[in-house]
């Protein structure tokens, strides 16, 4: 089998063997090496010499195999836009940002550019759990049987109703979706409308 060509090598059909790590240089009609992530082109290739790469300076990066002559400047996450940093910029990766707690992404252009406050969920509901935090505004769902939520809040969760018996008390009023069970001392009389027996 013939040895594989090593850049730079001639290409008549304007395509290169390895599209990720090589690129076509039309002036010389040759395939040259791209520079790996974290580097940039410090000297372009010629027919007799391959691309020369150099490491990105501090506070700059290139994320992909490239033939860029500069590195991209690291940008901080903009708190005015509701963003916070989850991973710092490195020579190989831009700063990773996300929406601050209690916010969701309202504008997206390849990445989130602007976050807004999550809307409140009213009493008796909670925000549906999302696979990814900050991806969208709250979708409020009712509390399930045996659970309640008594505030207007973007993040409060439905909680189980209290069991009065565990505190040596009895139930004065059952819990609802918006309120916990009301417990009372067993010696206090029940209001007339609450009297009766409870069976499973």
């Amino acid at each position: 089998s013939q040895p594989q060509a090593v850049p730079p090598y001639a290409s008549e059909n304007q395509t290169c063997r390895d599209q990720e790590k090589e690129y076509y240089e039309p002036q010389h009609r040759i395939c040259c090496s791209r520079c790996p992530p974290g580097t940039y082109v410090s000297a372009k290739c010629s027919r007799i010499r391959d691309t020369v790469c150099a490491t990105c300076a501090e506070n700059s990066y290139n994320e992909h195999w490239n033939y860029l002559t500069i590195c991209q400047l690291c940008r901080p996450c903009d708190p005015v836009m509701g963003l916070e940093e989850i991973a710092p910029c490195t020579s190989k990766r831009k700063t990773q940002c996300r929406c601050q707690p209690g916010m969701f992404c309202a504008a997206w252009a390849l990445e989130c550019t602007h976050c807004e406050l999550l809307s409140d969920c009213p009493p008796g509901t909670e925000a549906e759990l999302k696979d990814e935090v900050g991806k969208g505004n709250n979708h409020c769902v009712p509390c399930k049987a045996g659970h309640f939520q008594n505030t207007s809040s973007p993040s409060a969760r439905c909680q189980p109703h209290t069991r009065c018996e565990n505190q040596g008390l009895v139930e004065a009023a059952p819990g609802t979706a918006q309120s916990d069970t009301t417990c009372k001392n067993p010696l206090e009389p029940l209001p007339p409308e609450m009297s009766g027996t409870m069976l499973m």
Partner: antibody, heavy 124, light 106 residues
């Protein structure tokens, strides 16, 4: 780690009673309900009731009321399930399982972990 | 009394997605729980409160619950997932189990 260890297999005659034990470790015994679930060979799971180890209060479905008694000994972190007036259809594996927090309503809990199961055979 | 209905069996090829349903009157108003049971073993909690996964349960297990139906979904099913699966819910303070579904990985 949280663990429930049950007593060994039992063989009983019809009309007799059986008492299965379930020893808890790795957590505060009085803070969580103990539930009992049974499973006849090749059949599904059948819930038999709950017990609050803190108060001793219990809840049984209608099917088992009058025949099942759930008790506990908090000093040794052990729950018991006694089934009386045994018949052949009570032959099954009996499981104990930790339920929800005793301070919250029964219907807020789930069963985790489970004991290893106790086979009770009812045969004349 | 409250009842939960499951299909007796579901078959799936390795790597494919398996869906097991559990239906009951207004089940979406209650929390659904799912248990896996392999032959000769005790049941194991795999999903609680409709969609939450206990620690140690692989990400391929997921759940949903709305209307009258709760669904357990196993994506990228593996041979080791072959087992019986039971749904469970509470009708006030009474525990109710579905009849169980045997998942066969072909």
């Amino acid at each position: 780690q949280v663990q429930l260890v049950q007593s060994g297999a039992e063989v009983k005659k019809p009309g007799a009673s059986v008492k299965v034990s379930c020893k808890a470790s790795g957590y505060t015994f009085t803070s969580y309900d103990i539930n009992w679930v049974r499973q006849a060979t090749g059949q599904g799971l059948e819930w038999m009731g709950w017990m609050n180890p803190n108060t001793g209060n219990t809840g049984y479905p209608q099917k088992f009321q009058g025949r099942v008694t759930m008790t506990r000994n908090t000093s040794i972190s052990t729950a018991y399930m006694e089934l009386s007036s045994l018949r052949s259809e009570d032959t099954a594996v009996y499981y104990c399982a930790r339920g929800g927090l005793t301070m919250k309503v029964v219907g807020a809990g789930w069963f985790d972990p489970w004991g290893q199961g106790t086979l009770v055979t009812v045969s004349s | 009394s409250y009842e939960l209905t499951q299909p007796p069996s579901v078959s799936v090829s390795p790597g494919q997605t398996a869906s097991i349903t559990c239906s009951g009157d207004k089940l979406g108003d209650k929390y659904a729980f799912w248990y896996q049971q392999k032959p000769g073993q005790s049941p194991l909690l795999v999903i609680y409160q409709d969609k939450k996964r206990p620690s140690g349960i692989p990400e391929r297990f997921s759940g949903s619950n709305s209307g009258n139906t709760a669904t357990l979904t196993i994506s990228g099913t593996q041979a080791m997932d072959e087992a019986d699966y039971y749904c469970q819910a509470w009708d006030i303070s009474t525990g109710v189990f579905g009849g169980g579904t045997k998942l066969t990985v072909l």
